[in-house]
Interface confidence: low
């Protein structure tokens, strides 16, 4: 006769393990009792269980609890036992060892191989802004049995780069995503990937890119000149510029504090009824908290009995 | 772990209203930032809204002007209330969030709920 089992048996992380040892035998033979032992390599043997077939189960102090017959109905030539919950530490070589009659002993090993499945970890990086150059988006770390694969889906062009860290039972690997950072990478997702046999899906972490920037400011209000006359009601210079975080306003006049009845409101300057003392040079300053930029405007306001031309002056400045 | 819950989605006509909720629960830290995605069929998941929880905004232009997020920090729900609604903002609407773990920092942890559908039809 001759026992049949397995090379490798492959199980997750507090699954049951099932550790196959069958005896095909000729006509007649008996299986006396199945002795399971743990062999690792540089290490005596240890029992694990025996299964005698009239005495029955026999479990080790070690592994009580833990070491079961699979359910019936039982072939009486089959020794294969069940390792419940299994964990890392049970990972290593396995020996069954059958007695017959009368055709006597036969033994067999398998490997037992626990797969740890990772529990990866997301690190954003330094805070991101415009401007600067290659910089870490984020950094993802997966440690398992064996070593994960870490990879990047995202929309956002980046480069990545990985390591990985042996230790004794798993490694770790670490996957880094640098990129150049945009004002249109605001908001977008950045997802790691981890893969694993022992994982029945891949795992995912999503990171949302947050981009600090500050767009140059300009000034709307002024682009029909004619319309700022005297005595023109509902005159208004808007201050446009967008950012992350979202931008303060404030305004000034450049050439004096600003007239009386001149309303801010946030990025819009709103004006009384017009009147030359409305004339003069004004500024929208613009800032976050990762700049500031300023934009210049000069009003001429017109006397409709005179014909001289507006003048307007548009300057913009960082 | 937390768990997002979101309401409020439905069909409305183009140009009609409607307010999605979102509740967070099941954490014992700070929820950070909370807000909107959606995803329309055969398209990338995209930015709707979020807000902070100390009140800073963030709009996907497409929604400037039409959309309002707001938050009780105290429930732990953002609402996102959308106005003149167009066909095009029919979506799956995602919740998220993410938040701070017990030695105050960010966890790198992003958090979904389930979506809630919103149809734009007449």
């Known amino acids: 006769g001759e026992l049949e089992t397995s090379d490798v048996v492959t199980v997750v992380l507090g699954q049951d393990a099932k550790l196959p040892c069958f005896y095909r035998g000729d006509s007649g033979e008996q299986v006396g009792q199945v002795a399971w032992a743990r062999v690792d390599a540089g290490e005596g043997a240890q029992e694990l269980a025996l299964l005698h077939s009239k005495y029955g189960l026999h479990v080790s102090p070690a592994y009580e609890g833990r070491v079961e017959q699979p359910p019936p109905p039982r072939n009486p030539l089959d020794g294969s036992v069940l390792l419940r919950n299994a964990v890392q530490a049970d990972e290593g070589e396995y020996e069954c060892r059958v007695s017959t009659f009368p055709a006597g002993s036969f033994q067999a090993r398998l490997r037992l191989r626990v797969l740890v499945p990772p529990l990866p970890s997301l690190n954003p990086g330094p805070a991101l802004e415009e401007g600067q150059g290659l910089t870490l988006a984020a950094s993802c770390t997966a440690e398992g049995s064996p070593a994960p694969s870490v990879t990047w889906d995202t929309e956002v062009k980046g480069t990545t780069s990985s390591r990985s860290f042996k230790h004794s039972r798993s490694a770790a690997v670490t996957s880094e995503f640098h990129l150049v950072p945009s004002r249109s990478m605001n908001g977008q997702p950045l997802t790691c990937v981890v893969s694993h046999p022992g994982l029945l899906q891949d795992q995912r972490i999503t990171h949302i890119l947050h981009v600090s920037f500050l767009a140059e400011a300009s000034v709307r209000g002024l682009e029909d000149q004619n319309l700022w006359h005297i005595g023109r009601e509902g005159a208004m210079l808007k201050c446009l510029s967008e950012g992350q975080p979202p931008p303060s306003y404030n305004w000034t006049r450049l050439d004096g504090p600003l007239p009386s009845g001149v309303r801010v409101d946030g990025d819009t300057l709103g004006f009384p009824p017009l009147t030359t003392e409305h004339s003069g040079i004004y500024v929208c300053h613009v800032s976050n908290e990762f700049s500031s930029r300023d934009s210049q405007v000069t009003v001429d306001v017109l006397d409709p009995q005179e014909d001289s031309g507006k003048q307007v002056d548009l300057v913009s400045a960082s | 772990q937390v768990q997002l819950v979101e309401s409020g989605g439905g069909l409305v006509q183009p140009g009609g209203s409607l307010r999605l909720s979102c509740a967070a629960s099941?954490?014992?830290?700070?929820?950070?930032?909370m807000g909107w995605y959606r995803q329309a069929p055969g398209k990338q998941r995209e930015l709707v809204a979020t807000?902070?929880?100390?009140?800073?905004?963030n709009y996907a232009d497409s929604v400037k002007g039409r959309f309002t997020i707001s938050r009780d920090n105290a429930k732990n729900t953002v609402y996102l209330q959308m106005n003149s609604l167009k066909p095009e903002d029919t979506a799956v609407y995602y919740c998220?969030?993410?938040?701070?773990?017990?030695?105050?920092?960010?966890?790198?942890?992003?958090?979904w709920g389930q979506g809630t559908q919103v149809t734009v039809s007449s």
């Open positions: 807000v902070t929880s100390g009140g800073s905004l």
């Open positions: 099941g954490s014992d830290f700070t929820i950070n930032v």
């Open positions: 998220t969030a993410d938040q701070f773990g017990p030695l105050g920092h960010l966890s790198p942890i992003i958090y």
